[in-house]
């Protein structure tokens, strides 16, 4: 009775999401077989989040929008442990819009999700960011620097990250 | 190339307002944020602010908000710049400058110089 | 405001010479430092940004230097087209500043 009332309510929390997310891959989380945290497929996980690249070209309005439909941001990177992971699945020739942006150019950076920024937990390429007329930042490859932060026009359309919360049923 | 042509000399007397010109010709106007810069003997250069034709928003160097009002025509490549209720102090020569990366200034107008007399 | 100490504010020397001009700035800058030239004319010229990046045309007898606080610009075998006043300026923090100027004569 117990275990059926509880399969109910995860259909039910699953239908929710069937509208952006046709499918999820669900792994339990530690040994409580009453646990498990999803992602969309073929969203990839780490932590609490999930991570999804968008290879369409879009503006940083129209990627930040394209997240949203599916219920996430364009990624809050808040930890070099994040970073790494999220890398693994870029391509080194293209370039990533990020959740950042400097709406004013008065260079006050700020992130999508309203998360302070910290100077302190920025990963900018040398150098980086250089221009007042470029307000929103990208992550990208450079072969003296490995992969860090960019400003760039946000009408000049490139690849995103998205990133949303992990889904408990 | 790049070219910024500001507009002539200009004598006023205390008081009025003045509205100054600098065209942008040989890239694309609406893609580099516009400077202004004020020359004078007793400061030297002082940065007035910037404007970007692109978002149609400005950024004042605090001690010129209510002195300066900064505008642009896209259609002209032109950026604007008035200055008000001028005072001697105001006496000095005026600078366009195109925004470039690193926070320099690429290119210089030839300078408009303003003359405040009585 | 973040101020722009310059020095010397003036100087004289004498063609082929090498000339050095320093900036210090109040606080760190991160190498956000450019440096430009007031010909006679009154026309301003870009020579140096980011620190020691020479702008386009600008001949490679000039050459930029420092880091943190303290930066300086040099000028070898100088030649009779360099006398003007030379400029620093910072753009790590708006407003953005310049320091009070260098006037290079040839003696």
């Known amino acids: 009775n117990f275990m059926y009332s509880k399969t109910v309510k995860r259909l039910s929390k699953l239908r929710e999401y069937q509208q952006y997310h046709p499918s999820l891959t669900c792994v339990m989380e530690g040994k409580d077989i009453e646990d498990w945290s999803c992602c969309p497929t073929p969203w990839t996980s780490f932590q609490s989040s999930c991570y999804f690249i968008s290879t369409g070209m879009q503006s940083w309005t129209k990627s930040q929008k394209n997240c949203s439909v599916m219920g996430a941001d364009l990624v809050v990177i808040n930890t070099r442990e994040e970073q790494d992971f999220i890398i693994q699945n870029l391509k080194r020739n293209s370039s990533y819009f990020l959740g950042l942006s400097d709406p004013g150019g008065r260079r006050h950076w700020q992130w999508v999700d309203q998360t302070p920024y910290n100077e302190n937990v920025t990963f900018w390429h040398s150098g980086e960011p250089n221009n007042l007329d470029e307000r929103c930042a990208i992550i990208n490859f450079r072969s003296s620097e490995e992969w860090g932060w960019n400003d760039i026009h946000c009408h000049v359309p490139q690849k995103s990250i998205c990133k949303m919360k992990k889904i408990y049923i | 190339q790049v070219q910024l042509q500001q507009s002539g000399a200009e004598l006023v007397g205390p008081g009025v307002s003045v509205k100054i010109s600098c065209k942008g010709s040989g890239y694309t106007f609406t893609d580099y944020s516009m400077h202004w810069v004020k020359q004078s003997h007793a400061k030297s250069l002082e940065w007035i602010g910037v404007i970007s034709p692109y978002y149609g928003d400005t950024n004042y160097n605090q001690k010129f908000k209510g002195k300066a009002t900064m505008t642009v025509d896209k259609s002209s490549s032109t950026a604007y710049m008035e200055l008000a209720s001028l005072t001697s102090e105001d006496s000095a020569i005026y600078f366009c400058?195109?925004?470039?990366?690193?926070?320099?200034?690429?290119?210089w107008g030839q300078g408009t110089l303003v003359t405040v007399s009585a | 405001d973040l101020q722009m100490t310059q020095t010397p504010s003036s100087l004289s020397a004498s063609l082929g010479d090498r000339v050095t001009i320093s900036c210090r700035a109040s606080?760190?800058?991160?190498?956000?430092l450019s440096w430009y030239q007031e010909k006679p004319d009154g026309t301003f010229k870009l020579l140096i940004y980011?620190?020691?990046r020479l702008h386009s045309g600008v001949p490679s007898r000039f050459s930029g230097s420092g880091s943190g606080t303290d930066y300086s610009l040099t000028v070898r075998n100088l030649e009779q087209e360099d006398i003007g006043t030379y400029f620093c300026?910072?753009?790590?923090?708006?407003?953005?500043?310049f320091g009070g100027g260098t006037k290079l004569e040839i003696r």
């Open positions: 980011y620190t020691s």
């Open positions: 400058a195109r925004n470039d990366d690193y926070y320099r200034f690429a290119y």
């Open positions: 300026q910072q753009g790590k923090t708006l407003p953005w500043t």
């Open positions: 606080q760190d800058i991160n190498n956000y």
